[in-house]
Structure formats: C-alpha cells, structure tokens
Interface confidence: low
C-alpha cells in the first residue's frame, strides 16, 4: 500500500469493571478493542470501514497500560495500511469489548459485550509526529495517539508519489523526502540514467556508459575524442572529419602519396625537354625535336624530323643528313622545283597555281593533305596539341583531344572540379581527387555516390575481413572497419600493395 494509519493505545481505565449496559463483568472486564477507520463523515454511521479495520487480542482486565509491541499477536501501535492517496480527513471508531472467551482471538467468541466506544472525526496530515488524545465517558477513559505515515517507497503529502531507490541500468538515484529523484554522483537526466562523462569529453564524438569515461565514436581518438582518425594509408595528409585524407600542399592521389611538384623536386626531363606536373606518374616530359623516351633521354636519327621536302629521301650522315631529291627538284631539302603546272606536279587532287610568270608553281592542297605537292597525309597530332596528358586522335579533316578525368577544353587545358555537378546524394561531402570525385557519406548511407540507404545492423553480418574490428557509427546502419597492420580497403580486404576500392564508409 501507499501509507499506514497507526494507532497507539496507551492506557485504558475501567475502574468499576462495568459494561456499557450497566452490568458488571465477572470476575473483571477482559478487554479487547475493535478499530474501524473510514472516510470522513460529519455524522458517523454504521457501515463498511472503508479505510480498514483491525481487532486486538485481550490486552488487559478493567484498567491497564498498553505496552508497545512490534510483532506477533497484540502488536502496538496498530497498523491500518491503505493503498490510495491519503485524503487528509478521516473518521475513527474505537470500541472496547469484554470477552468471556479466547484471549488471542476474542473476535470469534460468542457472548462478547461492548464496554465503551469513542468516535473521532477530523483532518490529519501525513507526518511522523504522533497526535495524542484522551477520551472520557462516565465509566471509562482511553489514552491513545495516532498518525499517518507513508509506506516504504511512497512519498509526498498524500503518499501518492512512488519512488524506489535504484542503481542499475534503468537509473542511479536515491529518493528525496518529497519523492523526487536525487541522482547518485556521476549521473544525470530525468531518471538519472545518463552518465556524466569525463570532463571535456567531446559532446558529439565521444560518449560514456559509466561516469568519468570518454569512449570515442568510430573515427575519433584522443583522451577527449576530439582528434579525428585519418583514412587508413593516408601518407601526406590530415583530417578534419574521420576517415578523411586531406592532402598536404604539393601532394595528391587518394592517399596523398603522389608528388604534385615532381618536376621541381626531381627534374626528371633531359635534353632541354619541358616537364609538366601531370600524367599517371605525376609528371610528363615533352621532348625537343630529335629526342624521345620517357625522360627525352634518347637521341633520334637526324632524319627522324623528315627534313626532305617534295618526296626527297633522307640519308643519315655523321653529324648531319643528306636529301636525295626526285626529278624536278633541287636544294638542301629538295625545296626548289624545276617543274611547272604543265607537269601536273600536284598530287591527291591538289590544284596548281603558276608563279613567277610560269617559271614555278604552288599547289593548293585539299583537306587532309600537305607538302609542296600535296604528297603528305596530314597528321594533326604531331605537334602534341593536347595538354595535361590528353590523348590526341585524328578524326578525318580534324583532330580531337580526349582529356583525362578532371580536365576539359579543346586542348584539355582547363582543369574542372568534378564536384561542381554535386555527384554525392543524401548530403554526402564531395572531394576532388586525381582520379575523380570521392563522396564521404553521412551515417546510414553508402556507395560511391552515397546512393545506398543502409537499414540493417551493419556489423551483424561480419563485413570486415582479415581480423579487422567492426564499429557501428552514430546509428547502427553504417560501419567502419579498423584494419590490422598490412591490410587496407573499406573492409580490410586487400593486402598492402593491391589497389583498394574507395568507399569512405561502407
């Protein structure tokens, strides 16, 4: 129940040993009491004891003092428990009876006779202080005291507030006198079920399951969980968010392991060639005429530049070359002609125009042909017109540059941001990298473009390989694999040295 009405009988006096009807008890009045507690009535009436009733064994004969007794038969004070909100008012009827029968259970004996009764009506607040009273009539006097107290775990002015101290996963608290919770040290919250983490523990990146600890969420480290963990394998980079690898100045590639200033740092291009910080190795050498090789380290044949015009054939000599001219041509490069338009010197549909009063001529070549006599098919890629590692392709009368990812323009001369077209779905963060854009996905999404919604407990299926540890994120729908030494990849599936696939968060 929520409370107890307690009645302490102190002394009963019936000096003449008389009953209410005027008769006397023989040999004396063997006295027990019946108590009836009910709701407040201005005029006390018979009827059920709505708040409870109790009887005592025989407590004495005629006049006697009632001693306190805490257990067993004849317990004093008498206890009338109730399990409702105490209303603050009551009616109490105390009857003294004489029994000729059993001392312990006089209630059941026949022939019981009323000695006297008192009725008390009034208000009574819950509290520990006893209210003492004494009632007299012509024959008897009764001294008693009474109070209402709350049962264990009940509190408040009407014992209506239930509070049971606890120290388990549902809460860590004691109860205040008014029934409100008082959190144990290190705990907070309405139900004192939220631990107070280590002072300074990062609010978002750290948490605790017991007081004074700071457990880092995946991707964070440090005593206060305020340092992000960069992506596994990040060489020359840092992070501002977990699993990021933001490259230091001059470094590129997924793991910031490609030197973007290779030309300056290493001067790899030989023989006066031009170095540009591009291409699959981080640099490209553009050779001067007469040289070839990755670093322009190889000298070409002197005839390699095709110096002989008008179909002349080139012969290498010690430090030079010699042109053997076809009939009708002369000069060091066979550049002079002895022919006229009458000799039909223009090939491939070229049209002939006379010059110098018909002593010489010039050929006007159709598209795709060149040379003094339109004898050469045009290769528009010989001048290496495509910048930034673009690939030159002859397309009929013109040529096109096929650009590497991240470049555009007729000659691939313009660098574009892959992130400009917002490729990342569901609020993913885009990063421009050498090999294209990369998305960092928010919790609950994955895929190259954060297009996949994850709806299961991601670690339950054991997605991490090679002994890696799986961590779920802020929600159970994303996971991060913490790879052991020697393995990389979002699931730690690749030994170091093999190319991992990229998703930041699986």
């Amino acid at each position: 129940g929520s409370g107890i009405f307690q009645l302490r009988l102190q002394e009963f006096v019936n000096q003449r040993g008389m009953l209410a009807n005027g008769q006397s008890c023989e040999p004396g009045c063997r006295t027990f009491f019946r108590i009836c507690l009910k709701h407040f009535q201005a005029t006390f009436s018979e009827g059920p004891c709505t708040f409870g009733n109790v009887s005592t064994p025989v407590l004495g004969t005629n006049s006697f003092v009632v001693r306190d007794k805490n257990s067993g038969s004849g317990r004093n004070p008498l206890q009338l428990p109730f399990n409702f909100t105490w209303p603050g008012t009551f009616s109490l009827n105390i009857q003294a009876w004489h029994t000729p029968g059993d001392d312990l259970r006089p209630e059941t004996s026949p022939g019981n006779s009323l000695i006297s009764q008192i009725i008390i009506q009034g208000s009574l607040a819950v509290g520990k202080i006893w209210r003492t009273d004494e009632q007299n009539d012509t024959l008897t006097r009764l001294s008693y005291s009474y109070r209402v107290i709350c049962s264990d775990n009940y509190y408040g002015e009407s014992c209506s507030r239930l509070c049971k101290k606890r120290d388990d996963h549902f809460g860590h608290y004691e109860c205040q006198p008014d029934g409100s919770l008082s959190c144990l040290p290190g705990w907070t919250g309405k139900y004192c079920d939220q631990p107070i983490c280590l002072s300074g523990c990062h609010e978002q990146n750290g948490y605790c399951s017991k007081p004074d600890e700071c457990i880092c969420r995946p991707g964070w480290q440090g005593r206060l969980c305020n340092e992000c963990i960069p992506h596994n394998g990040c060489r020359h980079g840092t992070c501002s968010i977990p699993w990021q690898c933001a490259c230091d100045e001059g470094w590129g590639g997924l793991f910031c392991d490609q030197d973007l200033n290779y030309c300056t740092h290493h001067s790899p291009c030989k023989n006066g060639s031009t170095c540009s910080n591009s291409g699959p190795k981080g640099y490209t050498c553009t050779c001067l005429p007469g040289y070839t090789g990755e670093h322009c380290e190889l000298g070409l044949s002197k005839c390699a530049s095709n110096p002989c015009r008008n179909g002349g054939s080139c012969k290498d000599q010690e430090n030079s070359y010699h042109c053997l001219c076809p009939p009708g041509y002369y000069g060091q490069h066979c550049e002079h002609s002895t022919l006229t338009c009458a000799d039909s010197p223009c090939f491939n549909g070229g049209s002939c125009r006379e010059r110098n009063q018909g002593s010489s001529y010039a050929c006007e070549c159709p598209p795709n042909f060149t040379g003094s006599n339109c004898e050469k098919k045009v290769d528009r890629c010989t001048s290496n017109p495509c910048a930034n590692g673009g690939q030159c392709q002859n397309r009929g009368p013109s040529r096109t540059c096929r650009c590497r990812p991240g470049f555009t323009g007729t000659h691939c001369e313009l660098h574009i941001s892959d992130c400009a077209r917002s490729p990342c779905a569901h609020g993913g963060t885009c990063h421009d990298l050498e090999n294209g854009p990369v998305c960092t996905c928010p919790a609950g999404f994955s895929g190259r473009r954060c297009e996949v919604r994850i709806t299961h407990d991601a670690c339950a299926s054991g997605p991490c390989f090679n002994g890696a540890t799986c961590y779920t994120g802020l929600s159970p729908n994303n996971f991060v694999c913490n790879c052991p030494y020697g393995f990389v990849g979002s699931r730690c599936e690749f030994p170091v040295g093999l190319p991992p696939s990229f998703p930041w968060v699986a």
């Epitope: 549902f170 809460g171 309405k190 139900y191 079920d193 159970p476």
Partner: nanobody, 120 residues
C-alpha cells in the same frame, strides 16, 4: 485515458509456452516504449522485458533471456510476450507497463495484470 489490458495468461505445464498480449489505448502507441514485469506472491516485482518505441532496442532480464521474446505490432497497438520453456518459478501475475516515453525508463502506466501459473 491511457489503458493497458493484458491477456493470454493461464495454467501451463513446465516446459510449455504462453503468449501474453498487451493492448494499449489512450495514447500515441508508437511514441512509447512498452515493458513487462511480474510479481509472485510475497515477492518483489521483477522487470522482465522492454521494447523501445521503434522496436529497435529490447531488454531482457537474465532470468528469462533466451526463453522469452518481446515484440510489438504498432498497427494493432499491441505488445506481445512469447514465453517458451516455462518453469514453475515463472508463476506470477504479469503486468505490462509504459514509461510514457520512447525509451525504456521507469514506469508511468500499468495494466491490471494476467495470472500465469506453471505447474504439473
């Protein structure tokens, strides 16, 4: 008015099964966690199981772990307690309760209870 009504109790032999239901009304059911506790005569109430508003978080007391399963059907405003491998010590009055919030914290409303007796 919030109401929780338990049903499904009864007499069952040791090793048998029962499925208790708790039908709720008077509040937005899928906003609240719902739990079960039991009380045997003369004993303290014992928390058995609880399920969060979303159904994503469930709690089981050690004494019933692996034998009892809690679930909820938000469309029917009902929580179920499937009790398998019942033992005599599972005999008690079973009550369903809600803390009146989404997580399993404390008790705000309870039902009238349903008696489960496990005896041969």
């Amino acid at each position: 008015e919030v109401q929780l009504v338990e049903s499904g109790g009864g007499l069952v032999q040791p090793g048998g099964s029962l499925r208790l239901s708790c039908a709720a009304s008077g509040f937005t059911f899928d906003d609240y966690a719902i739990g079960w506790f039991r009380q045997a005569p003369g004993k303290e109430p014992e928390e058995i199981s609880c399920i969060s508003s979303s159904g994503g978080i469930t709690y089981y007391a050690d004494s019933v772990k692996g034998r009892f399963t809690i679930s909820r059907d938000n469309a029917k405003n009902t929580v179920y307690l499937q009790m398998n491998s019942l033992k005599p010590e599972d005999t008690a009055v079973y009550y369903c309760a809600t803390p009146g919030i989404a997580a399993c914290r404390g008790i705000h409303y309870t039902g009238q209870g349903t008696q489960v007796t496990v005896s041969s």
